[in-house]
């Protein structure tokens, strides 16, 4: 499965949609910025087999999809952009799932790195907690949008590293 080819374009499209979703000036939200502790070490990728790497990417995209599928999200973002973004994420999830299935039998190692997936889950829990504490304010969502863009950019680098490994 040539993951990066199918996935990189989708990742770029998702990033562009996220960029377009901004509704308020981020400069009015400087005081709301927060360190969510992105699990960078899980995206360094050296210790992973390909199927494990794909499962971590899948978890990140699944969690992003869940986050932007909430009613609070629908109340914040422009509907047509949100729908396009969700469709893009859904397509990426399908691509990744197909990839994982192809990798079964190719590798002897377990399909999932449980610790890495847990780290990604906890990262998104911190994001959700922050939004709750900030009462889903426009600035809180703006901070989260920037964080997700940053994490997508980092996962893009991760995918490029996977491509080089191939």
């Amino acid at each position: 499965c040539d993951l990066p080819q199918t996935h990189s374009l989708g990742n770029r499209r998702a990033l562009i949609l996220l960029a377009q979703m901004g509704r308020i000036s981020p400069f009015s939200c400087l005081k709301d910025r927060h360190d969510f502790g992105f699990p960078q070490e899980e995206f360094d990728g050296n210790q992973f087999q390909k199927a494990q790497a794909i499962s971590v990417l899948h978890e990140m995209i699944q969690q992003t999809f869940n986050l932007f599928s909430t009613k609070d999200s629908s109340a914040t973002w422009e509907q047509s952009l949100l729908e396009k973004f969700s469709t893009e994420l859904n397509q990426q999830l399908n691509d990744l799932e197909a990839c994982v299935i192809q990798e079964v039998g190719v590798e002897e190692t377990p399909l999932m790195n449980v610790d890495s997936i847990l780290a990604v889950k906890k990262y998104f829990q911190r994001i959700t907690l922050y939004l709750t504490e900030k009462k889903y304010s426009p600035c809180a969502w703006e901070v989260v949008r920037a964080e997700i863009m940053r994490s997508f950019s980092l996962s893009k680098i991760f995918q490029e590293r996977l491509r080089r490994k191939e």
């Epitope: 990033l15 562009i16 502790g37 901070v143 940053r150």
Partner: antibody, heavy 120, light 111 residues
Framework: QVQLQESGTVLARPGASVKMSCKAS????????MHWVKQRPGQGLEWIGV????????TYNQKFKDKAKLTAVTSANTAYMELSSLTNEDSAVYFC?????????????WGQGTTVTVSS | DIVLTQSPASLAVSLGQRATISCRAS??????????MHWYQQKPGQTPKLLIY???NLESGVPARFSGSGSGTDFTLNIHPVEEEDAATYYC?????????FGSGTKLEIK
């Protein structure tokens, strides 16, 4: 690769206006904020303001609010800064710089600078 | 506006030794786990180059002899061991609040 190409040296009279350009290539111009920074000869750096080419949203350093006007033309992948009512204090090198890491607001790529000389 | 005071204004360090540059902010630039202080290097006739972001994160491609530390109002850039090519002016910049400001610069000379 990412490049920011700025317009050449400008010589202007006091009281006049100048408009400089910054042509971006090698990345998605509409999805990165673009900062402008001033550097007077032998001196430090001053942040002028920032523009988001995707929607034209701008934020200024209050000190430059009545001095600088930032615009962008997405079809040309070009950002512009117009300086008005020029005085000797405006003689400087002006850099356009790409915002980096989203809301960390650092600057990773810099144009080569446009030199503005104000003289009668 | 937050004022960034860099010290010393200039320093001369022998090849292979340690250079330490300080940047003090008039108000805290740290919030919720991040310190919004960044460091740049500018060589004569060149544009500034990002070295360190968020006080201690090394920018990709920057040699590991550069390191940053600090939080709140006090920040430090260390270069060890210093090499000839490190002769430049170093600036700190904060993005804690508007307007973003830069320090006045520290000129590093290699002995």
């Amino acid at each position: 690769q990412v490049q920011l190409q700025e317009s050449g040296t400008v010589l202007a009279r006091p009281g006049a206006s100048v408009k400089m350009s910054c042509k971006a290539s090698g990345y998605s111009f509409t999805t990165y904020w673009m900062h402008w920074v001033k550097q007077r000869p032998g001196q430090g750096l001053e942040w002028i303001g920032v523009i988001y080419p995707g929607n034209g949203d701008t934020t200024y350093n209050q000190k430059f609010k009545d001095k600088a006007k930032l615009t962008a033309v997405t079809s040309a992948n070009t950002a512009y800064m117009e300086l008005s009512s020029l005085t000797n204090e405006d003689s400087a090198v002006y850099f356009c710089t790409r915002n980096y890491k989203y809301d960390y607001y650092t600057m990773d790529y810099w144009g080569q600078g446009t030199t503005v000389t104000v003289s009668s | 506006d937050i004022v960034l005071t860099q010290s010393p204004a200039s320093l001369a360090v022998s090849l292979g030794q340690r250079a330490t540059i300080s940047c003090r902010a008039s108000k805290s630039v740290s919030t919720s786990g991040h310190s919004y202080m960044h460091w740049y290097q500018q060589k004569p006739g060149q544009t500034p180059k990002l070295l360190i972001y968020l006080a201690s994160n090394l920018e990709s491609g920057v040699p590991a002899r550069f390191s940053g530390s600090g939080s709140g109002t006090d920040f430090t850039l260390n270069i060890h061991p210093v090499e000839e090519e490190d002769a430049a002016t170093y600036y700190c910049q904060h993005s804690g609040e508007l307007p973003f400001t830069f320090g006045s610069g520290t000129k590093l000379e290699i002995k």
